[in-house]
Structures are given as structure tokens and as C-alpha cells.
């Protein structure tokens, strides 16, 4: 499939101009290669009318130009003084016309309306409101006022001052007669339909002295805004329908066959199953505007989207709408990463999150998608040293491996951790990705004691048993804190006896704390990694108490206390609503507020990512 994208249809009127934008992946080769606009010939081929290398056909001389915008991967063709001869099938493309790096565009130039003299033209968007003003003279002030629509050769009454309303306009039309000072009456039509377009005649009086005024109503279907996003990336649809529908239910739908528009999400709580875990509808502003964020873009997400307002929460005739044509570029700059990561209860997952490598200094985040109402994504961790209180000791965001990827590790998994998580940064909003964590049957691979108590001034040895499957991995112990997990020295104690059917390659690696102090209290992780890529981890909480009896403590698996369940939500809890997710520039303000609240919270971490493969939780 060609990665070039543009408008499928362009409609205009004789004498007018059009501006056609075509999108291409902004690789260095594409940025510098020839751009062209060609017309498809009746006998094959596509004949260049204008190109970026200076060619302008005689047909276009003096009325067209082509401008390349390499920095954002677009080029624009402007054509002026359109005639009906310009109607036809075109392509915009890159390179050589016959090579297929192009997009088909249909240009339709229609004749301008043949209007009667003194005709007032009203041009209004579909679903909006029009007010047709009708002046009259004093002698007709007390006479019947009416509005007719020309249907073929005959005028058909639409509304009049005696109370008649044509059934096609019921519930959406009114006739207002201004105060005595103004010789004017108005007809207001709401929820305009395409079928309302046409020639109207308003009239005051019914005899030969009546006052008449012609009006031409043009109802415009909104031209879709072109949106070009990368596979696996993110898109935001900003929908501003105006304050008059501020209190009406809003929706985003995707056009399927014909005129059908399947609801993707609406403010009445409906959400299409295909978008579970990867969509947020941001709360409306007072003016009725709202936005919808979709992450983890798939090929099948491409198409025409409409946002609108209607009490049913779905598209109906007369809904005010905005339109987008979404193209999903399969030559994506966003790398593949797992869309599903599996872990076992008590075990861990390590999730890789991609980010735009040009933004290595950006703040990284990880949030948990919640589907209630319109969806939201409260933050769990960031790269600035903040971790949500109940995730202390079991969640860490690491800048490794770097160069476009960061890692999030979550351990002590429970069934409540199953769900969708988003990776994001305060930089490029297109690089939001989604991953689903699934909790499956099984036992954790790493075996550690539960809670451990150390004695002040003594030595503590904590074991971690690694099965033979991790023989080629680097094994480590580290102390968790809000900025990550600081590596500690550990000892290889030889083969472990903790595994059945496991040979000499299993390992027991111990952490030794000499002369324990109060500062040693906290969470410790043992884990495996290969270079900068992290695998499974297991966590142990070490408590420190006063000396009771002399000697060192060597903790075994059998003596371990039960691990504590999740901590309850405390006052340090922080959540950034979807508004911040939708516009990460808001993070800075939210963070400043949060920092003052969360100083007791002392924890730091990060965000998660997605693609088309699945990844197990135990290793990479």
C-alpha cells in the first residue's frame, strides 16, 4: 500500500481555487525526491501537470504552483481559475509517475449557481442554524408572511405567520417578526440537512403588492481534515461544535459502508470494543468542545471519522459534525513492541516503551487506563522521581535501554494489575503507546522470602533462587527507591535446591547486608537482565528492628513471612486526568501541584508500550 495520502475528493466551483495537501513519510530520500501532480489520461498513464522540479504544463501556466514542506512531510498544490475542464482523476505522488508512490484524487468542478438578481446567498455547515432575513414595506406589515422553497418549477410553502409548518421542517423552524420599528421578518432553520439546500422565496402579502426576496441556501458537508499518523502511534481529534450544543451528548463515529457511522465513543458511556484500552474522551469545555485520543493505531483504524452532537449519542440527520480522514502510515517510525505482556500472580513484568529518540530528555510517564465513563489514565510513575503511593516498592521506570526506549518494571503482580497501560512523554504526543498486562496461571520463576526482619548492627543474608532457564542472564540485587533500583553487591552461592527437575545451572544468589542500619530498611529486588534489557524481578521488604539476641540472620524461603498485600491508597495519591494525558504540556502544572502534596510519597517510575506481538513476563 502506498504511504502517500491526500484528499480522495475535492469539490469546487468554476472560477474558484483549490489547495490540495499530500502527505508522505518524511524520510531523507522522500524529502528531496521529485513531487508531482498528474492527471490520469484516458489512454493510460498519469501525465504531469506540475512538479517540484520546475515543470508547469501549459494548462497550468500562471494559475498553479506546487510547494514542498519537507520538514513536515507534505506538499501543497494550489490551482486557481478552475474550469469544468479541470474535473477529472488525478494523482499526487513522489518520484516517477508510474512507480506507485502516489495517491488518487478526484477533482470535481461544478458550474456556479445561476442565481436570480437580488438573491442573498446563505452558506451554512450541515447541522448548523441559518437565519433568512426578509424585508417588507409598511403596507404589508399586517399581512401574511411566508417562506417558500422552489422544488422543480413550483414553490412549496415551508412556513407562514398563520402557524403552518411543512412536515419536513417540524421541530426545527420558526418565523420571527421583528418589533414594530423594523420592517423585517426572519425564518430560523436549525439542524440543517443537505436536503434543505436550494432556492427560497420569502414573501410579505399575497397580492400584486407583496414584497418578495430570493435566497439561495447552500448546506456544506464538512470537508474532512486530513490526518496522517504512524502505525502504532497516537491521534487526537479535537472537536469544537460550538456553545449551542454544549449540553448535548457528544460522539465520535467511524463511517462504514454507505452512510452508516459506527460509534467509537460517546459521552453516554458507549465505547466500541476494538478501542478498549486505547481511547480517551476528554471532558468537554464550557463551549462544548472536546477531544478524543486514540493510541496504538492499527491499519484498520484508517478511515473517515465524524464527531458530532445529538441527544442519542450517535449520528442523526441534522447533527452538527466535524470530519477527519485518518491515514495510518505503515512505514512507521514507531518501533514494534508487544501489545500484550503476560505475568503470573506474585511474579513481574518488564515492559518496553518507545519514545521519540530526538526527545531523550523528555519526562517519561506510565499510566493505567480506566474505562469508567469516558475513560481516563491516572499516572502511576514518572521519570522525575514520582511513584503513586500504593505502587511503592513494586514499580520502577528506568531510562534504559535508552535511545528511543525506556523500561517499566512492575512486580508483586496480582489479578488487579491486569489491564491496559499507556506509555507517554511530555514531548511528542504521537508517541503514546498501549500495552495490555494479562495475569496468567503459573508460579513466579524467581524465589525469594517474603518479608524479612533485620537486626540493627548485625549481618543479614537474603537468598534469591534463579531457575536454570536464566543461566545465561546477568543476576543482580538492587535496592528500590523512587528514582529506580540501585545495584548492590551479591554472592553466587552455587546451585539452588529450590527447583525440582533443574540441573546445576540453577543458582542461589544472596544479598548480604553487613552491620545493618536503619537506612537499610526498604524494598530490595533480585532480578535478571541481559545488557540493558530487563527480565523478571522479585521483591523483598526488609524491616529493621532493635537487637534482641546476638548473631547474624540468614533468611531461608521456609522462614519467610507472608508478603504484605498492596498498600491502600494514601493521601499521597496523585492522578492526572485525561486532560493532561491529552495535552502533556499540562503535566508541568499538574506536577508542580502534585510535588507539594507528594513529598511524603518518595517514589519514582515510568510508562508502558504496545505493538503486535505478545511478550511473556519472565524474560526477554
Amino acid at each position: 500500500k502506498s504511504p502517500i495520502f491526500g484528499p480522495e475528493e475535492v469539490n469546487s466551483v468554476e472560477g474558484n481555487s483549490v489547495s490540495i495537501t499530500c502527505y508522505y513519510p518524511p524520510t531523507s530520500v522522500n524529502r528531496h525526491t521529485r513531487k508531482y501532480w498528474c492527471r490520469q489520461g484516458a489512454r493510460g498513464g498519469c501525465i504531469t501537470l506540475i512538479s517540484s522540479e520546475g515543470y508547469v504544463s501549459s494548462k497550468y501556466a500562471g494559475r498553479a504552483n506546487l510547494t514542498n514542506f519537507p520538514e513536515n512531510g507534505t506538499f501543497v498544490v494550489n490551482i486557481a481559475q478552475l474550469s469544468q475542464d479541470d474535473s477529472g482523476r488525478y494523482k499526487c505522488g513522489l518520484g516517477i509517475n508510474s512507480r506507485g508512490l502516489s495517491f488518487d484524487v478526484s477533482l470535481e468542478v461544478s458550474q456556479g449557481p445561476g442565481l436570480l438578481n437580488d438573491t442573498k446567498v446563505y452558506t451554512v455547515d450541515l447541522g448548523r442554524t441559518v437565519t433568512i432575513n426578509c424585508p417588507f414595506k409598511t403596507e404589508n406589515a399586517q399581512k401574511r408572511k411566508s417562506l417558500y422553497k422552489q422544488i422543480g418549477l413550483y414553490p412549496v410553502l415551508v412556513i407562514d405567520s398563520s402557524g403552518y409548518v411543512n412536515p419536513n421542517y417540524t421541530g426545527r423552524i420558526r418565523l420571527d417578526i421583528q418589533g414594530t420599528g423594523q420592517l423585517l421578518f426572519s425564518v430560523v432553520i436549525n439542524q440543517l440537512r443537505l436536503s434543505d439546500a436550494g432556492q427560497y422565496l420569502c414573501q410579505a402579502g399575497d397580492d400584486s403588492n407583496s414584497n418578495k426576496k430570493n435566497a439561495d441556501l447552500q448546506v456544506l458537508k464538512p470537508e474532512p481534515e486530513l490526518v496522517y499518523e504512524d502505525l502504532r502511534g497516537s491521534v487526537t481529534f479535537h472537536c469544537a461544535l460550538g456553545p449551542e450544543v454544549a449540553n448535548v451528548a457528544k460522539f465520535l463515529c467511524r463511517q462504514s459502508s454507505g452512510e452508516n457511522c459506527d460509534v467509537v465513543v460517546n459521552t453516554l458511556g458507549k465505547r466500541a470494543p476494538a478501542f478498549e484500552g486505547r481511547i480517551l474522551l476528554n471532558p468537554q469545555d464550557k463551549d462544548g468542545s472536546f477531544s478524543v485520543v486514540i493510541t496504538g493505531l492499527r491499519k484498520e483504524d484508517a478511515g473517515r471519522y465524524l464527531c458530532g452532537a445529538h441527544s442519542d449519542g450517535q449520528l442523526q440527520e441534522g447533527s452538527p459534525i466535524q470530519a477527519w480522514q485518518l491515514f495510518v502510515n505503515e512505514e512507521s517510525t514507531i518501533p514494534r513492541s508487544p501489545t500484550v505482556v503476560k505475568g503470573v500472580a506474585g511474579g513481574s513484568v518488564a515492559v518496553l516503551c518507545p519514545y521519540n529518540r530526538k526527545e531523550s530528555k523528555s519526562i517519561k510517564y506510565w499510566c493505567l487506563w480506566e474505562g469508567a465513563q469516558n475513560g481516563r489514565c491516572p499516572l502511576l510513575v514518572d521519570s522525575e522521581g514520582w511513584v503513586k503511593a500504593q505502587y511503592e516498592g513494586r514499580l520502577s521506570l528506568l531510562e534504559e535501554p535508552g535511545n528511543g526506549t525506556f523500561t517499566v518494571i512492575l512486580n508483586q503482580l496480582t489479578s488487579r494489575d491486569a489491564g491496559f497501560y499507556w506509555c507517554l512523554t511530555n514531548g511528542d504526543t504521537l508517541w503514546r503507546t498501549t500495552v495490555e498486562i494479562k495475569i496468567i496461571e503459573g508460579e513466579p520463576n524467581l524465589k525469594v522470602p517474603g518479608n524479612v526482619t533485620a537486626v540493627l548492627g548485625e549481618t543479614l543474608k537474603v537468598p534469591c533462587h534463579f531457575p536454570c532457564k536464566f543461566s545465561s542472564y546477568e543476576k543482580y540485587w538492587c535496592k528500590w527507591n523512587n528514582t529506580g533500583c540501585q545495584a548492590l553487591p551479591s554472592q553466587d552461592e552455587g546451585p539452588s535446591k529450590a527447583f525440582v527437575n533443574c540441573d546445576e545451572n540453577s543458582r542461589l544468589v544472596s544479598l548480604t547486608l553487613n552491620l545493618v542500619t536503619r537506612a537499610d530498611e526498604g524494598w530490595y529486588w533480585c532480578g535478571v537482565k541481559q545488557g540493558h534489557f530487563y527480565g523478571e524481578t522479585a521483591a523483598v521488604y526488609v524491616a529493621v528492628e532493635e537487637r534482641k539476641a546476638a548473631g547474624s540472620r540468614d533468611v531461608s524461603l521456609a522462614k519467610a513471612d507472608a508478603a504484605p498485600d498492596e498498600k491502600v491508597l494514601d493521601s499521597g495519591f496523585r492522578e492526572i486526568e485525561n486532560k493532561a494525558i491529552q495535552d502533556p504540556r499540562l503535566f508541568a502544572e499538574e506536577k508542580a501541584v502534585a510535588d507539594t502534596r507528594d513529598q511524603a510519597d518518595g517514589s519514582r517510575a515510568s510508562v508502558d508500550s504496545g505493538s503486535s506481538e505478545e511478550q511473556g513476563g519472565s524474560s526477554r
Epitope: G41, R43, G44, I47, S57, S58, I96, N97
Partner: nanobody
Framework: EVQLVESGGGLVQPGGSLRLSCAAS????????IGWFRQAPGKEREGVSC????????YYADSVKGRFTISRDNAKNTVYLQMNSLKPEDTAVYYC??????????????????????WGQGTQVTVSS
Amino acid sequence: EVQLVESGGGLVQPGGSLRLSCAASGFTLDYYDIGWFRQAPGKEREGVSCTSSSDGSTYYADSVKGRFTISRDNAKNTVYLQMNSLKPEDTAVYYCATTFGDACTVVAGIPDQYDFGSWGQGTQVTVSS
């Protein structure tokens, strides 16, 4: 093998005439629009003339209008460029090339060189006293 061969070039004095021929082998020219191009030393290749296969219409660059005439003889599978009143600035290598059957008409002139598929090897025309 599909081939275009130009001939008829040479040295001529200003005001003189030459007739260039473009003979096709391996395919018939009557389906294609044919263009003549030229390239002077150190300059870009430029379109000179184009003849349409669909309606026989002909198109010329402003610099040669009224002096050059393009014609075709489908029976001989050849296209000609008659060049009169030659000027020193007409000195160049002249090439003929084929394009889609309605290209000249679509652009109402000489199509972009990128739209031409098969090209001849060129014939040198030198106008000098």
C-alpha cells in the same frame, strides 16, 4: 528490442534548415504521443515539440514556434522535426521520446520529460557561421 533512432543532425549556418527523423523499431509509434527535446551544453534538457496520436494536434515551445514543424508518417513508423530559420541558440543534442497516447493533449503542450518512457540516443545539431 524497442528502439528509437534519431538522424538528420549536422552543421548548418544561421538561417538554414534541417530535417530530423525519429525511427521506431520493435513497436508502432501510432499509439504514442511523441516529443522532441534538446539539451545544449551545460543546460537543462528542454521540450521542443509534441505530436498527439489521438487527434494529431501539435504543440511547440515558445522559442521555436513558427520555425519548427513536427509531423509523423505512421506507415514508415517515423516522426520528423522540420527546423527552419535556425539560430545559434538552437545548437544542442536533439532527442525524440515516446509518452502516453494523450499526454500532449492533457497538458496542452509538451509534457514533463519524466512522462516519456523510451528515448533515442540523440543527434547533434550545430548552428554556426
